[in-house]
């Protein structure tokens, strides 16, 4: 069908609550495109009828709510005037008790589930709520170990819980809860967050911290399109540069002629005491020469790499 395949990271979510995923691929979706969602390679698109439990809402796929049987690979097909890209998203649904935030045993946990507070500082936790405009979110309540959080040190500000003068006792299992309204119906959204405390000031003075990647290999099929984010936390006043390099050369320079591998535009989210930066690397088409080569994310003096690896052959197919 001529569509390029792009494989996104797994998303792990809990059953019986709303979930939404936005089909965005900045090099493509910035222009005039059409987006269509499918499940498990089905030829029939996901419904656009807003009364359907699972439906497409503009570029989003929306589950109201997510159910146990919704696990699987979803594809969104982005068609432009001269291009077609198919983005694969693997959704894994798990059962979760309302106050159960200990999901550390699950693979590929998003950093939204694991947050850090800095000892002795004023810091904050963020309730990550990603939904289309059709969803209206009510005020957020915060819990720790299944009990509502209160006290003069805690302030709820929009999607954040501000914690003043962080102490060692603030570690533990938190949850944030909001009521989502869609087409007159109400749903409860609950996100679990495991919080650890670090004694380092800010994010280690001027030394940025690369959250992802973690010096590891990624299995990827030959010929596919791949996007890898480099996520970096750094102080607000930092002057560090963030970039992707290969063979000690900026990827944009190294692949200047073919432009087959490019660095994306850096974005950042501002928190109270630090910034979270994201800069991606896009492999438009993975070639044999890419395997075994360390692609380095640099952030100031910090570095982390990924190495592309061919998937192990599946002998069950023979």
């Amino acid at each position: 069908d001529g569509c390029k395949d792009i494989f996104m990271k797994n998303e792990i979510l809990s059953a019986s609550q709303p979930f939404a995923f936005n089909c965005t691929f900045p090099p493509i979706t910035s222009g005039e495109v059409s987006v269509t969602w499918y499940k498990n390679s089905s030829k029939i698109p996901v419904s656009k009828i807003i009364q359907s439990r699972i439906h497409q809402d503009e570029t989003w796929i929306l589950f109201l709510p997510m159910e146990w049987g919704d696990s699987g690979v979803y594809q969104c097909v982005i068609k432009g005037r001269d291009s077609c890209h198919r983005i694969h998203v693997n959704l894994t649904v798990f059962e979760k008790h309302w106050c159960d935030t200990s999901i550390g045993g699950l693979p590929n946990l998003s950093d939204e589930y694991k947050q850090i507070l800095h000892l002795g500082k004023d810091d904050s936790l963020t309730c990550h709520l990603h939904f289309p405009k059709s969803c209206v979110l009510g005020p957020i309540k915060w819990y720790k170990d299944c009990n509502e959080i209160k006290g003069e040190r805690f302030t709820v500000l929009e999607t954040r819980l501000l914690v003043s003068n962080v102490s060692a006792e603030d570690r533990g299992n938190y949850a944030c809860q909001a009521i989502l309204t869609h087409s007159g119906k109400q749903y409860e959204v609950l996100n679990g967050i495991t919080v650890s405390i670090t004694e380092r000031a800010g994010y280690g003075g001027s030394v940025p911290k690369i959250i992802y990647p973690k010096n590891h290999s990624i299995e990827v099929q030959l010929g596919t399109t791949l996007i890898v984010d480099c996520n970096v936390t750094d102080t607000k006043d930092n002057t560090n540069l963030r970039c992707w390099r290969v063979n000690n050369t900026l990827v944009d320079d190294y692949y200047d002629e073919s432009k087959r591998i490019r660095e994306g535009v850096e974005t950042h989210v501002s928190f109270r005491e630090h910034n979270l930066y994201t800069v991606n690397i896009t492999f438009l088409e993975v070639k044999m020469e890419d395997y075994g080569l360390p692609f380095m994310c640099h952030a100031g003096v910090s570095t982390a790499y990924i190495i592309l690896q061919l998937p192990a052959p599946d002998f069950r197919a023979y």
Epitope: S102, K144, G151, E152, R153, S167, E169, N173
Partner: antibody, heavy 116, light 107 residues
Framework: QVQLVQSGAEVKKPGASVKVSCKVS????????MNWVNQAPGQGLEWMGM????????RLAQKFKGRVTMTVDKSTSTVYMELSSLRSEDTAVYYC?????????WGQGTLVTVSS | DIQMTQSPSSLSASVGDRVTITCRAS??????LNWLQQKPGKAPKRLIY???SLDPGVPSRFSGSRSGTDYTLTISSLQPEDFATYYC?????????FGQGTKVEIK
């Protein structure tokens, strides 16, 4: 260092009341719930209820509603548990336990003996 | 109320033995379960928080796990100082409830 220091042992007559204190140091007193747990001689642990020092919200086990009062003195970072209409089966060790994270720290216990 | 059924109520074991204690919750409590150790005349001490998180200073021979509504405390190699009574505690919803306790004695 977190410490929960409880008041000393008490001997009471049936029908009387007892007030046990639990003084907290080493963490932000008004940020976390405080639980009370009892243990009769040779028996297991039983949750009585909890109080939040910030606003004195209290939750009690059904068995203790009407007989237990939990209070807070923010100025001294102390929580109190008062048990009224004492009977012989209330003879037990009473513990306070903080929920900085669930039941992380415990007081040393206060033995209350109810005897005529 | 959520009932916690703990077994066995007592067990005899030797130093070096592997010991397992189980608690079954009458309904879903997620991972909101602690394991406590109590020695005679002393206050309980938390060993494990949130099903499997070891408290600071607790030896690594202690571990906690979960399968559905069954929760297990394992002592991989029993030491002389481990002879005590162990309790599970659910804090998913009040009233919080304890297991009946397991007394670990010297064989």
């Amino acid at each position: 260092q977190v410490q929960l220091v409880q008041s000393g042992a008490e001997v009471k007559k049936p029908g009387a009341s007892v007030k046990v204190s639990c003084k907290v140091s080493g963490y932000f007193f008004t940020s976390y719930w405080m639980n009370w747990v009892n243990q009769a001689p040779g028996q297991g642990l039983e949750w009585m209820g909890m109080i939040h020092p910030y606003d004195s919200e209290t939750r009690l086990a059904q068995k203790f509603k009407g007989r237990v009062t939990m209070t807070v003195d923010k100025s001294t970072s102390t929580v109190y548990m008062e048990l009224s209409s004492l009977r012989s089966e209330d003879t037990a060790v009473y513990y306070c336990a903080s929920s900085t994270t669930a039941f992380a720290y415990w007081g040393q216990g206060t033995l209350v003996t109810v005897s005529s | 109320d959520i009932q916690m059924t703990q077994s066995p109520s007592s067990l005899s074991a030797s130093v070096g033995d592997r010991v397992t204690i189980t608690c079954r919750a009458s309904q879903d409590i997620g991972n909101a379960l602690n394991w406590l150790q109590q020695k005679p005349g002393k206050a309980p001490k938390r060993l494990i928080y949130a099903t499997s998180s070891l408290d600071p200073g607790v030896p690594s021979r202690f571990s906690g796990s979960r399968s559905g509504t069954d929760y297990t405390l394992t002592i991989s190699s029993l030491q002389p100082e481990d002879f005590a009574t162990y309790y599970c505690l659910q804090y998913a919803s009040s009233p919080y409830t304890f297991g009946q306790g397991t007394k670990v004695e010297i064989k």
